[in-house]
């Protein structure tokens, strides 16, 4: 047992049929010593007598808000949560498995550029009782610090039968060094309680590989005299690292046809423009990528061609 | 080329080899199945690399007041990439296969240390640490594990020639 | 007590389908992870399959991926296991275990034979 | 994947004497998550030890588990009748989870 904040205490329980539990001993925060007694929940009914209450957790019934009283009067609270244990495997049943990159894939963070500014995100498809608190560190044995804000609703989804929905949180870490190698990745940690089950989950990464730049702005196209050629221009996104000389971007430049089926004609660039010839009913589109780091790719920016 | 007084290296050479290296390196060793090599244990490995850390200078300011510092910082860096490049890490079991794209890194880090430092002049370089895996099934992993850190050490040696040979050539 | 009871085996051609259920009692089923675990005859023991309490996660031997895939259905105390495009190497004895990772209980084992 | 090698292939011991049997990991096995289980002929597979050397519920205190990485040991410290059997070890630290081809404990 261990303590997740004032008066809330984490039970981590091996979790198979018939298991012998955990036994619990937990203290009333009093000075009284003398007419205590103990209720669990809403419950009236009567656990136990004494500065100290004696449980033998198994269950999810076992869990819950124990409360000693003394004369009417409520001494203190302690609410017990329950951590899952299957074979040695922490129970993953709040959140989705968005199996990208890899199976096991709870939370996906991504970055714009090298601030260390991040963004982190999780799927549940439970819509009430639910809870997220988040930590992140650099580095473990000797964390650097990392601020979070608060995880926030940032989408909501109909999947088949059941609503899909999408928690977010920000992150910077709060000394970073956006032209360093980084030598520790980054940690974050997710605490999710939904009604009286805990868990945790976290992802360990490091921002150069977490990078994906905004789609290049301003795409523009300019039609080259007495041919069937543009000249297409684009600029950084302004969210990447400046100066741009040191943190460089490539670029892929793409003429796609009206249908999905024609042939797709690439041109990849380091430079702002390219000259590529333009189909009647195409479309051209470019994306962004750190020009010496095989990150992801940016979203496409797209114009058509006519 | 860095010569004991502490002029400028051919920058765009260097820009162009040092690029040249990027791609290498990812052609050695695309993401393979994501394997994540954080879980597998890596602490006694790839500690030891050498890392272009905050204060070596190789920030575009850094390299303003005295791009010396970072050069030799990615010279040692080099050097014991190269090293590793040509250990039995590399050279044992499993054979790498003959068009593998390591021999090319392995000549490429050598290039453009030389490029960084001529004949005569010595910095000081860091010891390589004694990493011997018994089982080829460790030496692969040793090797995703080193040619991923090359892969990081590479991209910011990339952005420190590409922005010296945009501002500080001649 | 815990029990657990398969049922569902018998003989079938290659590239034919079957559907193994266990009953499960004794225990709060729609708390815990199940598995089937296969033994072909006189051989050893394969980890076929497991889901999770809510049926949310599931695994698969590589040797069965796209062909079987593992269900439950909490309100009736049963797991399931649809076997499809089924091999002669399936033939096995098919057992219905608790847990995730460790099978700590196990049900008698059905016989599922693919032959022509 | 991980692959499992039990050794011997058959033990011939008498009742009373001290039974080890070897389980080796092709590669190392994450936080020692092996299983030890126990198989009579007919019979279901039943759980003797897990997380390498914590005993199941009901298993007598005369088996034993011990190891760690790749190379792992179920000892039955004096050998019951009903010890005689096909004992199989099952790694779980990595997926697929994976068993060796079992070792046969029988009557000298």
């Known amino acids: 047992i261990w303590e997740l904040k004032k008066d809330v205490y984490v039970v981590e329980l091996d979790w198979y049929p018939d298991a012998p539990g955990e036994m619990v001993v937990l203290t009333c925060d009093t000075p009284e010593e003398d007419g205590i007694t103990w209720t669990l929940d809403q419950s009236s009914e009567v656990l136990g007598s004494g500065k100290t209450l004696t449980i033998q957790v198994k269950e999810f019934g076992d869990a819950g808000q124990y409360t000693c009283h003394k004369g009417g009067e409520v001494l203190s609270h302690s609410l017990l949560l329950l951590h899952k244990k299957e074979d040695g495997i922490w129970s993953t049943d709040i959140l989705k498995d968005q199996k990208e990159p890899k199976n096991k894939t709870f939370l996906r963070c991504e970055a714009k550029n090298y601030s260390g500014r991040f963004t982190c995100w999780w799927l549940t498809t439970i819509s009430t009782d639910l809870t997220f608190s988040v930590k992140s560190s650099r580095g473990s044995s000797d964390p650097q610090g990392v601020t979070c804000g608060a995880a926030t609703l940032s989408a909501e989804r109909v999947r088949g039968d059941n609503k899909e929905y999408e928690y977010s949180v920000e992150c910077q870490e709060d000394s970073a060094c956006p032209a360093a190698e980084e030598s520790l990745p980054i940690e974050v940690m997710v605490d999710a309680v939904h009604k009286l089950k805990y868990e945790n989950y976290t992802s360990s990464f490091f921002i150069r590989d977490i990078i994906k730049p905004d789609p290049p702005k301003n795409l523009q196209l300019k039609p080259l005299k007495n041919s069937r050629q543009v000249e297409v221009s684009w600029e950084y996104p302004d969210t990447w690292s400046t100066p741009h000389s040191y943190f460089s971007l490539t670029f892929c430049v793409q003429v796609q046809g009206k249908s999905k089926r024609e042939k797709k004609d690439r041109v990849f660039t380091d430079k702002t423009s390219a000259t590529v010839i333009c189909r009647k009913n195409a479309s051209i589109s470019v994306r962004a990528q750190d020009r010496y780091y095989s990150s992801s790719w940016s979203e496409w920016a797209s114009v058509p061609c006519s | 080329r860095a010569v004991p007084g502490g002029s400028s290296p051919a920058w765009t050479q260097c820009q162009q080899l040092s690029q040249k290296l990027c791609t290498l390196a990812w052609s050695a060793h695309p993401l393979v199945g994501h394997m994540d090599l954080r879980e597998e244990g890596d602490e006694e490995t790839t500690n030891d690399v050498p890392h272009i850390q905050c204060g070596d200078g190789c920030d575009p300011q850094g390299l303003r007041d005295n791009s010396q510092f970072c050069l030799q910082r990615i010279h040692q860096g080099l050097i014991f990439y190269e090293k590793l490049l040509g250990s039995d890490i590399f050279t044992g079991e499993p054979s790498l296969l003959p068009d593998s794209p390591v021999g090319q890194l392995h000549a490429s880090l050598l290039g453009l240390s030389q490029l960084l430092q001529p004949e005569g002049h010595h910095w000081e370089t860091q010891q390589i640490p004694s990493l011997s895996p018994s089982q080829p099934w460790q030496r692969l992993l040793l090797r995703f594990k080193i040619l991923r850190s090359l892969q990081a050490f590479v991209a910011v040696a990339a952005r420190v020639f590409a922005h010296g040979a945009a501002t500080l050539s001649p | 007590e815990v029990q657990l009871l398969e049922s569902g085996g018998g003989l079938v051609q290659p590239g034919g389908s079957l559907r193994l259920s266990c009953a499960a009692s004794?225990?709060?089923?729609?708390?815990?992870?199940m598995g089937w675990v296969r033994q072909a005859p006189g051989k050893g023991l394969e980890w076929v399959s497991y889901?999770?309490?809510?049926?949310?996660?599931?695994g698969y031997a590589d040797s069965v991926k796209g062909r079987f895939t593992i269900s439950r259905d909490n309100s009736k105390n049963t797991l399931y296991l649809q076997m499809n495009s089924l091999r002669a190497e399936d033939t096995a004895v098919y057992y219905c275990?608790?847990?995730?990772?460790?099978?700590?209980?196990w049900g008698q084992g059905t016989l599922v034979t693919v032959s022509s | 994947d991980i692959q499992m090698t039990q050794s011997p292939g058959t033990l011939s011991l008498s009742p009373g004497e001290r039974a080890t049997l070897s389980c080796r990991a092709s590669?190392?096995?994450?936080?020692?998550?092996l299983a030890w289980y126990q198989q009579k002929p007919g019979q279901a597979p039943r759980l003797l030890i897990y997380?390498?050397?914590s005993r199941a519920t009901g298993i007598p205190d005369r088996f034993s588990g011990s190891g760690s990485g790749t190379d792992f040991t179920l000892t039955i410290s004096r050998l019951e009748p009903e010890d005689f059997a096909v004992y199989y070890c099952?790694?779980?630290?990595?997926?697929?989870?994976?068993f060796g081809q079992g070792t046969k404990v029988e009557i000298k």
């Open positions: 275990a608790t847990g995730i990772a460790v099978a700590r209980y």
């Open positions: 004794g225990f709060t089923f729609s708390r815990y992870s």
């Open positions: 889901i999770s309490s809510s049926g949310g996660v599931t």
């Open positions: 590669q190392s096995v994450s936080s020692s998550y």
């Open positions: 997380g390498a050397s």
């Open positions: 099952q790694q779980y630290g990595s997926s697929p989870w994976t």
